[in-house]
């Protein structure tokens, strides 16, 4: 997990200032008001591995 201003969060995650860490964009389904979800809207999801 990366600090803001260094490297970005990995694909499928976004930085949360509230929690001070990268968070899973998948969790925005259950918690869409989370601060990091705005960043998820612009980022592509992690690909499925089928």
């Amino acid at each position: 997990e990366q600090a803001p201003g260094t490297a970005p969060c990995s694909r499928g995650s976004s930085w949360s200032a509230d929690l001070d860490k990268c968070m899973d964009c998948a969790s925005c389904r259950a918690r869409p008001k989370s601060d990091f979800c705005l960043g998820c809207a612009a980022a592509p999801p992690a690909p499925f591995r089928l």
């Epitope: 509230d18 929690l19 899973d24 259950a30 918690r31 999801p45 499925f48």
Partner: antibody, heavy 119, light 111 residues
């Protein structure tokens, strides 16, 4: 380091009551949904209760098997979550774990505490 | 409620070989982007330990020997190569809805 320290448990008679406690450290407690999960040879791992956040007036959810008998609560000022269990039954016997999740997966678990309901 | 069916119930694997554990959901637990299945490892006398989230994403510190896959209703946990320390019971869990439920577990033993 994330830690969930549990207390409570022991032997109680059918129809009796017991309160479990769990104190959290090492993460931003007030942002996380707090849960109780129990484990028994008969039922395996069974989620039983969840309490969400102050911003939504602490909504709670319960498994059908405990609804009306168990009450989950939390005190964010003490980083603590509780499970009040009333009208206990023999089938409530098991290991009780507190666990946290932000939304989906239970990423941290307490050490577990054993409850035995028997006469 | 969404029921998760794990198979096999127990599995005996030789050191260095592959262990494959299946988890089947009674309804789809996937969106177009994510699958809401997670995997845990439990050793005797310990609480479950979180391994894999959203079907295929390892938690930090989990060795690359552990991998997850699947979508819809069918999911798989693979361990390869199996090491001695992997002896445990493995559980899947869904977070599609309330209640979140767990599979009955798969006990992995080494030959």
């Amino acid at each position: 380091e994330v830690k969930l320290q549990q207390s409570g448990g022991g032997l109680v008679q059918p129809g009796g009551s017991m309160k479990l406690s769990c104190v959290a450290s090492g993460f931003t407690f007030s942002y996380y949904w707090m849960n109780w999960v129990r484990q028994s040879p008969e039922q395996g791992l069974e989620w039983i209760a969840e309490i969400r956040l102050q911003s939504n007036d602490y909504p709670t959810h319960y498994a059908e098997s405990v609804k009306g008998r168990f009450t989950i609560s939390r005190d964010d000022s003490k980083n603590s979550v509780y499970l009040q269990m009333n009208n206990l039954r023999p089938e409530d016997t098991g290991i009780y774990y507190c666990a946290c999740r932000y939304a989906d997966y239970f990423d941290h678990w307490g050490q577990g505490t054993t409850l035995t309901v028997s006469s | 409620d969404t029921v998760l069916t794990q198979s096999p119930a127990s599995l005996v694997v030789s050191l260095g070989q592959r262990a494959t554990i299946s988890c089947r959901a009674s309804q789809s637990v996937s969106t177009s982007d994510y699958s809401y299945i997670h995997w845990y490892q439990q050793k005797p006398g310990q609480p479950p330990k979180f391994l894999i989230k959203y079907a295929s994403n390892r938690d930090s510190g989990v060795p690359a020997r552990f991998s997850g896959s699947g979508s819809g209703t069918d999911f798989t946990l693979n361990i390869h190569p199996v090491e001695e320390d992997d002896t445990a019971i493995y559980y899947c869990q869904h977070s599609w809805e309330i209640p979140p439920t767990f599979g009955a577990g798969t006990k992995l033993e080494l030959q």
